[in-house]
Interface confidence: medium
């Protein structure tokens, strides 16, 4: 289970039209459910139940986004429509280039994602928890546009903001 280095990039424009980017670094883990490789894309927050619908019309997203899913306590969803692995597969089928699960409230999902799969996904499936998950969800919940950059080695530059 390798460390996944995740950079969340925010973009801020001003009336003059110039942009500043703000980068927040956090760490997660690559799960065995997916590949250990880098990925980048715009964050799309997905509700776990939103991944249940198998309707083709629900395929709303363009290819190349990073799905962020906050898993709920198992008691709140005792008979899930899909396993956690199934949800990751569904997101990738819909065009996700990577999936990040916040497992803080459902730590059992870690074992589910790390069970040796005969057919692992070809895209990374990362899980985060604790302070890193709080940091991620705080950005995802409050900001309009954010990009996630997932790497399997530490980013070269410090995670401070820089002008573009």
């Amino acid at each position: 289970k390798e460390t996944a280095f995740v950079e969340v990039v925010l973009f801020e424009s001003s009336p003059s039209g110039d942009y500043t980017t703000y980068t927040t670094g956090l760490t997660g883990r690559f799960s065995r459910a997916g590949a250990t490789l880098s990925a980048e894309g715009e964050i799309v927050q997905m509700h776990p139940l939103g991944l249940c619908n198998n309707n083709d019309e629900e395929d709303l997203y363009e290819y190349g986004w990073v799905g962020v899913v906050k898993l709920e306590q198992p008691e709140l969803d005792p008979k899930p429509c899909l396993t956690v692995l199934g949800k990751a597969k569904r997101a990738v089928q819909r065009g996700a280039t990577a999936v990040i699960f916040d497992v803080s409230e459902n730590p059992e999902a870690i074992d589910q994602l790390n069970q040796g799969s005969e057919d692992p996904l070809k895209r990374p499936v990362v899980y985060v928890k604790g302070a890193d998950a709080i940091k991620l969800m705080n950005i995802v919940n409050k900001q309009k546009v954010a990009r996630a950059r997932i790497q399997h080695r530490p980013p070269r530059q410090p995670t401070e903001y820089f002008d573009m």
Epitope: L10, F11, E12, S13, S14, P15, Y19, T20, Y22, E42, I43, V44, Q45, L60, Y61, E62, W65, N141, K142, Q143, K144, V145, A146, Y161
Partner: antibody
Framework: QVQLVQSGAEVKKPGASVKVSCKAS????????MHWVRQAPGQGLEWMGW????????RYAQNLQGRVTMTRDTSTSTVYMELSSLRSEDTAVYYC????????????????WGQGTLVTVSS | DIVMTQSPLSLPVTPGEPASISCRSS???????????LDWYLQKPGQSPQLLIY???NRASGVPDRFSGSGSGTDFTLKISRVEAEDVGVYYC?????????FGQGTKLEIK
């Protein structure tokens, strides 16, 4: 010029669902987020959520989570807001409002607004 | 979540006189880029809201220069230098820093 044209007034019974449309014209539809804001009779403005027409990504106000769904049809440049399990307190004028252009993570700015759609929930 | 509070809630004004509306946020709206993420909207009777001021002090396109916005951090003010009959309506401040977006309760400006 930029225009947002909303669907007509609706009368619904408690427990039913309503789907309001907002057709955009005069600009590149996929480049601008769309928000929904509602206003109960004689009350102030309440933000309901947004949809990114490019990715389809959404963000909803916490108090509406699970009851509201925002979708879009890029072929007709139309966004939709569906509210389910309606109750009397959902009686309001529902507005769509276009956000500003660009990749700004925050700095939300609503301009222009649709003409509004009155949804009445009554038994 | 950020909470917005406006005062007064009702503002009777004589045409030609100045008017001032206050808006306070529960946390600072000053972004690290130096801009205050606070907008003002006007909803005229029977109409949809319209953008007046964005980022604290920038007038939206077509807004007369008698309207001005000021303030920083948590305290903001909308001023109308000389009120005209067409300015009647409800004025709302809105924090545009982060979701969930929040409006003030509104200030109803009416002509005396």
């Amino acid at each position: 010029q930029v225009q947002l044209v909303q669907s007509g007034a609706e009368v619904k019974k408690p427990g039913a669902s309503v789907k309001v449309s907002c057709k955009a014209s005069g600009y590149t539809f996929s480049r601008y987020f769309m928000h929904w804001v509602r206003q109960a009779p004689g009350q102030g403005l309440e933000w309901m959520g947004w949809i990114n027409p490019n990715s389809g990504g959404t963000r909803y106000a916490q108090n509406l989570q699970g009851r509201v769904t925002m979708t879009r049809d890029t072929s007709t440049s139309t966004v939709y807001m569906e509210l389910s399990s309606l109750r009397s307190e959902d009686t309001a004028v529902y507005y769509c409002a276009r956000d500003q252009k660009g990749k700004s993570s925050s700095w939300f700015r609503f301009d222009p607004w649709g003409q509004g759609t009155l949804v009445t929930v009554s038994s | 979540d950020i909470v917005m509070t406006q005062s007064p809630l009702s503002l009777p004004v004589t045409p030609g006189e100045p008017a001032s509306i206050s808006c306070r946020s529960s946390q600072s709206l000053l972004h690290s880029n130096g801009y205050n993420y606070l907008d003002w909207y006007l909803q005229k009777p029977g109409q949809s809201p319209q953008l007046l001021i964005y980022l604290g002090s920038n007038r939206a396109s077509g807004v007369p220069d008698r309207f001005s916005g000021s303030g920083s951090g948590t305290d903001f003010t909308l001023k109308i230098s000389r009120v005209e009959a067409e300015d009647v309506g409800v004025y709302y401040c809105m924090q545009s820093l982060e979701a969930p977006l929040a409006f003030g309760q509104g200030t109803k400006l009416e002509i005396k």
